[in-house]
Interface confidence: medium
């Protein structure tokens, strides 16, 4: 062994995903999401599975409620460790409305631009996490069509927590979130009973995202 050899502590991805993907996670941060810690735990578990870097996978995060915020751009961080630190710091921005179409549309039009780090020829993946029917449902069909036209693969996650807590029917909500997912829906759509259960889908979601480059 060379005398200059050093042992360096680092976070190794749980499941190596060294493929090139540009992934934008679109998070519902409206008031009804609770507890927010469950969302950051989900992000942590998902992101630590990724090999993040300028030549590997890039991740950006957009949060929406009534308005949309770019939490960080695709090219903001160049390692998994940096992204994990940044994701833990994301605070819930709230909002009385769930503008899902606006969130997705902003991700498509802004987060996936070269100015924000998107790379030409690299597969685009969007992960949408929401807990309620959108207040801008009129635009949803159109916005999804626009994503389709730009070959953005979409994984959608329906959190049923607020519906279950209020003993409300989830049927219409689930149909809406299914409509967001790419085809085949059964491979791109997930639903969880509440926010705490988000972590239970990380392994399967991660495998399906990584399989896109296989």
């Amino acid at each position: 062994v060379s005398p200059t050899f050093q042992v360096v502590n680092s976070i190794a991805p749980v499941q190596e995903c060294s493929t090139q993907l540009d992934i934008v996670i679109v998070l519902d941060g409206s008031n009804s999401i609770y507890p927010w810690d469950s969302v950051t735990a989900f992000l942590n578990d998902l992101l630590e599975r990724m090999d993040i870097g300028p030549k590997q996978t890039q991740v950006g995060i957009v949060q929406y409620g009534e308005n949309v915020t770019h939490e960080f751009n695709l090219n903001k961080y160049s390692s998994t460790e940096e992204v994990l630190v940044a994701a833990k710091k994301i605070v819930q921005r709230g909002g009385r409305q769930t503008m899902t179409a606006l969130g997705i549309d902003t991700a498509r039009k802004e987060a996936f631009t070269e100015a924000r780090g998107a790379r030409r020829g690299v597969k685009k993946v969007m992960v949408i996490v929401t807990d309620g029917e959108s207040h801008d449902n009129h635009r949803l069909k159109k916005v999804i069509q626009d994503c389709e036209d730009e070959n953005i693969q979409r994984f959608s996650i329906a959190i049923l927590g607020s519906y279950n807590r209020g003993n409300l029917s989830t049927e219409k909500f689930v149909e809406e979130i299914k409509s967001i997912a790419s085809e085949p829906t059964e491979k791109h759509f997930f639903n969880v009973s509440d926010e705490l259960a988000l972590v239970t889908i990380v392994k399967t979601l991660g495998e399906r995202i990584f399989a896109l480059e296989a």
Epitope: Q97, M99, L102, D136, H138, R139, K142
Partner: antibody
Amino acid sequence: QVQLVQSGAEVKKPGASVKVSCKASGYTFTGYYLHWVRQAPGQGLEWMGWINPNSGGTNYAQKFQGRVTMTRDTSISTAYMELSRLRSDDTAVCYCVRAEDQQLLDAFDIWGQGTMVTVS
Amino acid sequence: EIVLTQSPDTLSLSPGERATLSCRASQSVSRSYLAWYQQKPGQAPRLLIYGASSRATGIPDRFSGSGSGTDFTLTISRLEPEDFAVYFCQQYGSSPLTFGGGTKVEIK
């Protein structure tokens, strides 16, 4: 300049169908959704639905489901709206309208001159 | 369906005066999806304001929009002769898209 030019006035009998055309010029036809809005004499505005000129995909207001058909011919940059089983209360001016998506998030920025459809 | 109620039905004012038009929604509307249009007799409507407060291209700065949630306002700071017309509000976020019944601004 950017404009939408619609076909001329129509007079129809109850039960018949009407097909109104809308020719776009001055912009990329397939780049913007087109909506149809109607206005009964002396009344307000009523949204009928939209067509995506790029894919041909449509979304109709529930009130008009089963009676309205929106189509397009990209080779001549023209959209069409056909309303069937006409009734006297369908008498209205029909407008085709462009929805601007990039800046305006689909507000209606360009309107056709309108086509008067009379059912009697 | 979101119902938009405009008031007053008619506003009688003189040129140079300030006009304040109200649009109230039956449920909350995002600012991003609220527009105002002007329509003159025999003409198609014209977009004035989008996103509740942004002026469309070529619209004079005497027109301004404000509001959020369920209450929105269009203000014309100093009425010009060409401003006497009917004004409609519209929400274009929730399906079906809906318009208010209109406010007519007429010369006193």
